[in-house]
Interface confidence: medium
């Protein structure tokens, strides 16, 4: 199955890394230090 982090969500995480949790078919952003929020866009 394709990883959506490499397609639809390729540029979703602003200051963080896109992670795909396959067993839940879910996408999450692992934020860089000091950043938070849905897309790691808040400081």
């Amino acid at each position: 199955k394709k990883n959506p982090c490499n397609a639809k969500f390729q540029n979703f995480c602003i200051h963080g890394e896109c992670k795909y949790i396959e067993h839940l078919e879910a996408v999450t952003c692992k934020c860089q230090q000091e950043y938070f929020g849905e897309r790691c866009g808040e400081k």
Epitope: L24, E25, A26, T28, C29, K30
Partner: antibody
Framework: EVQLVESGGGLVKPGGSLRLSCAAS????????MSWVRQAPEKGLEWVST????????YYPDSVKGRFTISRDNAKNSLYLQMNSLRAEDTAVYYC?????????????????WGQGTTVTVSS | DVVMTQSPLSLPVTLGDPASISCRSS???????????LHWYQQRPGQSPKLLIY???NRFDGVPDRFSGSGSGTDFTLKISRVEAEDVGVYYC?????????FGQGTKLEIK
């Protein structure tokens, strides 16, 4: 307002079947894994099932495996639990719960939204 | 299956006093990425459960700062710094690191 509303509970005889529904509103249903949790009278909480966002993956404890089936219809913002071969020990309040939020780094942080529950009574 | 054991099961507390609930798991709740999926739920009388603390120590939205969670591995604690009347209910620890997800038996907090 984020809301989950369960329905479909009732009285059923041992060996019978029941289908529970959960209507979701106020959030993007298709982005969240969903679960069912039950609570027998005067007892604690027991996890019953979880389904992934697209419905591809489903999970059950041994106590209901092979008898219960979780499913979802993202177009209708609805979650379902088909319960077959019901037993007296399945008598409980059944809660629909959201696994959320998945976008945050803390994606898997428990069940953050719960419905009011629907009562299932299995008795002859 | 991971067995979650809470103590005490009944907790009578005087208003304004602190309260502490212990939760032990039969195996480590740390996953391969180093995350620990141990959560605490509050269920007030006649109500649905509510998420209180997620991932050991993170307070959920709107949860008062008198609630705190701590612990690691297999040993976890929920603390209430000063108990208020609205805190009456049953508190459950729960793990979602391993399938099947499991809950503790619950701790009933009541006012003395």
């Amino acid at each position: 307002e984020v809301q989950l509303v369960e329905s479909g509970g009732g009285l059923v005889k041992p060996g019978g079947s029941l289908r529970l529904s959960c209507a979701a509103s106020g959030f993007t249903f298709s982005s969240y894994p969903m679960s069912w949790v039950r609570q027998a009278p005067e007892k604690g909480l027991e996890w019953v099932s979880t389904i992934s966002t697209g419905g591809t993956y489903t999970y059950y404890p041994d106590s209901v495996k092979g008898r219960f089936t979780i499913s979802r219809d993202n177009a209708k913002n609805s979650l379902y639990l088909q319960m077959n071969s019901l037993r007296a020990e399945d008598t409980a309040v059944y809660y629909c719960a959201r696994q959320g939020p998945i976008y945050y780094g803390n994606y898997y942080y428990g069940m953050d939204v719960w419905g009011q529950g629907t009562t299932v009574t299995v008795s002859s | 299956d991971v067995v979650m054991t809470q103590s005490p099961l009944s907790l009578p507390v005087t208003l304004g006093d602190p309260a502490s609930i212990s939760c032990r798991s039969s195996q480590s709740l740390v996953n391969q990425e180093g995350e620990t999926y141990l959560h605490w739920y509050q269920q007030r009388p006649g109500q649905s459960p509510k998420l209180l603390i997620y991932k050991v120590s993170n307070r959920f939205d709107g949860v008062p700062d008198r609630f705190s969670g701590s612990g690691s591995g297999t040993d976890f604690t929920l603390k209430i710094s000063r108990v208020e009347a609205e805190d009456v209910g049953v508190y459950y620890c729960s793990q979602s690191t391993h399938v099947p997800y499991t809950f503790g038996q619950g701790t009933k907090l009541e006012i003395k």
